[in-house]
Amino acid sequence: VKQIESKTAFQEALDAAGDKLVVVDFSATWCGPCKMIKPFFHSLSEKYSNVIFLEVDVDDCQDVASECEVKCMPTFQFFKKGQKVGEFSGANKEKLEAIINELC
């Protein structure tokens, strides 16, 4: 799982992914549900080796969170070829894996 610390790094990660699915976890250190789902998010990165997993701390990267229109945490966004292809909010493990499975 790659930590994103700037808008440039986020764009570079999307560009470098090529055709691969990119899953972005928008979270915050003070967010309880974010902490709950984080280990699961990391386990998915091992299970789905063909998928790129990114983490964005909304406090450290407000410009990325703002550009991606993140309103609550955790929010998961899914990108392919730089385009957003899906999104949902909430610490929902089942839905997170279901969407990855459908898109990867």
């Epitope: 949902f88 929902n92 894996e97 279901a98 499975n101 898109l103």
Partner: antibody, heavy 117, light 105 residues
């Protein structure tokens, strides 16, 4: 405890439509995808499609596109499968299912649909 | 769409015998799922993530495979194992195999 309770058996005429229901208890259907699976007599399992009840987003096996319509009512925690223009090929048991990725997943008891004149 | 081909379609085994059934996918998949179904009942999750046993499944069952080739093995057949087993993949469009009916000899 998670349970999926399906509606009762249906005997319908060719050309008619039927709407099956699947009411969930023990979890909120908005939290995952609800699937429907078909099993013809003495045959295997066929995935029909699924719905994300949180937003109504559906996906169908191309084979069932136009035949099946999946909907959900989050207020009653219920998913529905509507089958149209019924023929003898639609005679089957239809299951709703919570196809999870972990050790457990959950299936309804099945609804038998018989198409006969 | 990924087609799953199960083999054999029907097999019989005596108690104590080792049983292996296979499932071949038309394209590479990441994980295979297996279900057990007995007449008049809903399918039951039996194996998930290719090799993990669902809760309550006896340790005599095992699953293995990768890519396009997967299998379910019973180390020593017992009478209660007689059932139909379906393989299942969870890609963009989920599919099931046609099933392997395991009978008690």
């Amino acid at each position: 405890e998670v349970q999926l309770q399906q509606s009762g058996a249906e005997l319908v005429k060719p050309g008619a439509s039927v709407k099956l229901s699947c009411t969930a208890s023990g979890f909120n259907i908005k939290d995952t995808f609800m699937h429907w699976v078909k099993q013809r007599p003495e045959q295997g399992l066929e995935w029909i499609g699924r719905i994300d009840p949180a937003n109504g987003n559906t996906k169908y096996d191309p084979k069932f596109q136009g035949k099946a319509t999946i909907t959900a009512d989050t207020s009653s925690n219920t998913a529905y499968l509507q089958l149209s223009s019924l023929t003898s090929e639609d005679t089957a048991v239809y299951y709703c299912a919570l196809l999870q990725y972990s050790a457990m997943d959950y299936w309804g008891q099945g609804t038998s649909v018989t198409v006969s004149s | 769409q990924i087609v799953l081909t199960q083999s054999p379609a029907i097999m019989s085994a005596s108690p104590g015998e080792k049983v292996t059934m296979t499932c071949s996918a038309s394209s590479r998949i990441s994980y295979m799922y297996w279900y057990q179904q007995k007449p008049g009942t809903s399918p039951k999750r039996w194996i998930y993530d290719t090799s993990k046993l669902a809760s309550g499944v006896p340790a005599r069952f095992s699953g293995s495979g990768s890519g396009t080739s997967y299998s379910l093995t019973i180390s020593t057949m017992e009478a209660e194992d007689a059932a139909t087993y379906y393989c299942h993949q969870r890609s963009s469009y989920p599919t099931f195999g046609a099933g392997t009916k395991l009978e008690l000899k």
